[in-house]
Structures are given as structure tokens and as C-alpha cells.
């Protein structure tokens, strides 16, 4: 009987109440293996979640998180807020990163601007919330005289779009 | 030297999966972004994603988020991609490249990968 | 996701020729604009990084200029070993994009 049940293609199970039958998954289930005995349910993509690839006989359905949120853990399985570039997002909300770090994206943490130092380079560009420094030739390589860091850019959105 | 070493070349069945490495020495490997970048033949170079051995924290391009997983090993100062359910159009030369100081450019480069995918 | 246009796809010059290639993004990147070098042996060399920035160790003859949209990338006086590919590439914003390549040969 079990060499019955292998015969189950994707997207079908084995009934055991019709006798070994390979039977179509019933709606909003899936497999995604031959030789199942059930079927699984279908992924939901509901409330913060949004539905990317809908479910179908042999897949999963894949949910992506909705404007304003982003993914986290294997296959989305939780929404996190979003902040805005120079924040992270705390217990309580999302607070500006503080001063000698930056955050460049919508998530994640704030990090200490690169030590340029660290590899015998000078600072060209100055760190600033929404943006690490930008490292530079080394001191040495810099002409007598010259200043080794120029002022940030002027502060403008660059519309970053993280995963 | 500072220097990015990357595995040989590998030749997979379509719907395998691969692991490559990128083996960094001569700096401090938590201190900098690991980036992969896959150049098909004939084609120009596009950015997979990128790794901060440090916390592990990653990016992904949206094109790849379902094909590649990026991973370091702090302890050997090693980073990897691993590209599942392998296709033909995944045949390509792979690089991984550190960051110069900051992400925005990329100072190192690994000597790259082949992947081909064949039947 | 930003697109990088550049441009020529490939061009042929003579020994001591001025080269110069463009790269214009879709949208306003700053500074955040580098150029790369990648030799027939497919090795890949930082040139050029923030715009005009000269990468220690890389020739004088390369330059580069702009900025938002708009940059310039220059070989003063081309030499032999230059026979390479050249990519522009943006790091302003994820992910992370380069143009399709220049494809300098020597007449």
C-alpha cells in the first residue's frame, strides 16, 4: 500500500478513505511533495502581511510585509516598523541615532561611523546620521596644508529602499 | 597582504545548490561589509547582496532574496554565498569585494567564482 | 531601483587619445559614484570612488567629474595596458547598481 501512496504527485495526497486514491489537495492547501497522506494549509497573508506569490496546489502562499513595515525571520514571518534613515527603532518607537553613528536604511540599527583610521586613511566626507563617513587617502598622501575632511553633502532624501 | 580568496570553480545540475567562500586576510574581517556580486557571461556586474561579519546583519537585492543566502564565519574570517535551486541562468563568474572604509565603494576584490549549471 | 545608463557600450582609441565615458543615473545620487576597471583576465580594480576621488596607487590619467546625475569619467592619454572593461556604479541607495559596462580597445 505505501508503494500506492508514493505514486501522490505534488499537489495531490493519498486518501486513505478511498483506498490509497491520489486525491487533489481541497482548496487553500497545498503540497509540495509526492507520497503526502495530507495536505498542509495555506499560508494566510493577512493584517500586516500582504500576499506575494499566492498559494497554489503544490506551493506555499509567500507573504510580504505592507508600506511602512519590513520583513524579518526566514520567510517573513514577522513584520517590523519601519523608521526613517538616521533612526532605529527602540522599545519605545524610533529615535534619532546618536551622535558618531548612523543608520542608512528604513531598518535596522544605528552604527558607529567607520574608523578610517583603522586602515591608515584619513575622513574625506563627515558621518552624519543618515550616512557613514567616507574614507579618504591617508594623511600622508594628503598635500601640506590641505583640509582632510569636506562637510557633508547638503541633507536631502536619497530615497534609500532596503529589503 | 590584505586579500579576498574565494573556492574554485564549481559545475551543478540544475536544482542543486552551491556554497561558495570568500576567505579574507590581512585585516580586521568584522570591521567591513562583504559584498557579492555576479557577473553573467557577456553581461555587466550586479549587486546580490551584503553581509557585516561583525553582527551578521545583511541586504539583499529583491531579485535575489530567494536565491542567494549570505553568511560569515567570524572565526575564520570567512564569508559565503549559497545559491539554491540552481538554474541555467545562474551560470555565472561571482565576486565578493570589501568595502573601501565605508559601503559605498568597494576597494578588494575576490578573483571570482565560475558557477556553471548544466544538465 | 536606480538605473546606471552608460555610455558608449564599447569604444576604440589610438595610444595617447583623451577617452571619456558617461554614467547617468535615474535619479540623483550625490557624490556616491565610483568607477571600476576589470581587466580581460576578469580581475576588478577600484579607480575612481565619491565622484573625482583618485584610488592610491591608480595613474594620474584617470580622472572622474560630476555629480546628482551626471558624470564623467576620463583617460587623459590612453595607454596599452588600459584595454579593459570599465563599469560606473552607485552607492547612494539598496540596492546597489553599475552601469553595463564600456569596452575600451586600442586601434
Known amino acids: 500500500l505505501q508503494d500506492l501512496c508514493s505514486n501522490c504527485p505534488a499537489g495531490t495526497f493519498c486518501d486513505n478513505n478511498r483506498s490509497q486514491i491520489c486525491s487533489p489537495c481541497p482548496p487553500n492547501s497545498f503540497s509540495s511533495a509526492g507520497g503526502q497522506r495530507t495536505c498542509d494549509i495555506c499560508r494566510q497573508c493577512k493584517g500586516v502581511f500582504k500576499t506575494r506569490k499566492e498559494c497554489s496546489s503544490t506551493s506555499n502562499a509567500e507573504c510580504d510585509c505592507i508600506s511602512g513595515y519590513h520583513c524579518l525571520g526566514a520567510e517573513c514571518s514577522m513584520c517590523e516598523q519601519d523608521c526613517k534613515q538616521g533612526q532605529e527603532l527602540t522599545k519605545k518607537g524610533c529615535k534619532d541615532c546618536c551622535f558618531g553613528t548612523f543608520n542608512d536604511q528604513k531598518r535596522g540599527i544605528c552604527r558607529p561611523w567607520t574608523n578610517c583610521s583603522l586602515d591608515g586613511k584619513s575622513v574625506l566626507v563627515n558621518g552624519t546620521k543618515e550616512r557613514d563617513v567616507v574614507c579618504g587617502p591617508s594623511p600622508a598622501d594628503l598635500s601640506p596644508g590641505a583640509s582632510s575632511a569636506t562637510p557633508p553633502a547638503p541633507a536631502r532624501e536619497p530615497g534609500h529602499s532596503p529589503q | 597582504q590584505v586579500q579576498l580568496v574565494q573556492s574554485g570553480a564549481e559545475v551543478k545540475k540544475p536544482g542543486a545548490s552551491v556554497k561558495v567562500s570568500c576567505k579574507a586576510s590581512?585585516?580586521?574581517?568584522?570591521?567591513?561589509?562583504i559584498n557579492w556580486v555576479k557577473q553573467a557571461p557577456g553581461q555587466g556586474l550586479e549587486w546580490i547582496g551584503n553581509?557585516?561579519?561583525?553582527?551578521?546583519?545583511?541586504n539583499y537585492n529583491q531579485k535575489f532574496k530567494d536565491k542567494a543566502t549570505i553568511t560569515a564565519d567570524k572565526s575564520t574570517s570567512t564569508a559565503y554565498m549559497e545559491l539554491s535551486s540552481l538554474r541555467s541562468e545562474d551560470t555565472a563568474v561571482y565576486y565578493c569585494?570589501?568595502?573601501?572604509?565605508?559601503?559605498?565603494?568597494?576597494?578588494?576584490w575576490g578573483q571570482g567564482t565560475t558557477v556553471t549549471v548544466s544538465s | 531601483d536606480i538605473q546606471m545608463t552608460q555610455s558608449p557600450s564599447s569604444l576604440s582609441a589610438s595610444v595617447g587619445d583623451r577617452v571619456t565615458i558617461t554614467c547617468r543615473p535615474s535619479?540623483?545620487?550625490?557624490?556616491?559614484l565610483n568607477w571600476y576597471q576589470q581587466k580581460p583576465d576578469k580581475t576588478v580594480k577600484l579607480l575612481i570612488y565619491?565622484?573625482?576621488r583618485l584610488r592610491s596607487g591608480v595613474p594620474s590619467r584617470f580622472s572622474g567629474s560630476g555629480s546628482g546625475t551626471d558624470f564623467t569619467f576620463t583617460i587623459s592619454s590612453l595607454q596599452p595596458e588600459d584595454i579593459a572593461t570599465y563599469f560606473c556604479?552607485?552607492?547612494?541607495?539598496?540596492?546597489?547598481?553599475f552601469g553595463q559596462g564600456t569596452k575600451l580597445e586600442i586601434k
Open positions: 565619491y565622484t573625482s
Open positions: 569585494t570589501r568595502d573601501y572604509g565605508s559601503a559605498y565603494s568597494y576597494s578588494l
Open positions: 553581509i557585516y561579519p561583525s553582527d551578521s546583519y545583511t
Open positions: 556604479q552607485q552607492g547612494d541607495t539598496l540596492p546597489y547598481t
Open positions: 590581512g585585516y580586521t574581517f568584522t570591521s567591513y561589509w
Open positions: 535619479q540623483d545620487i550625490s557624490n556616491y
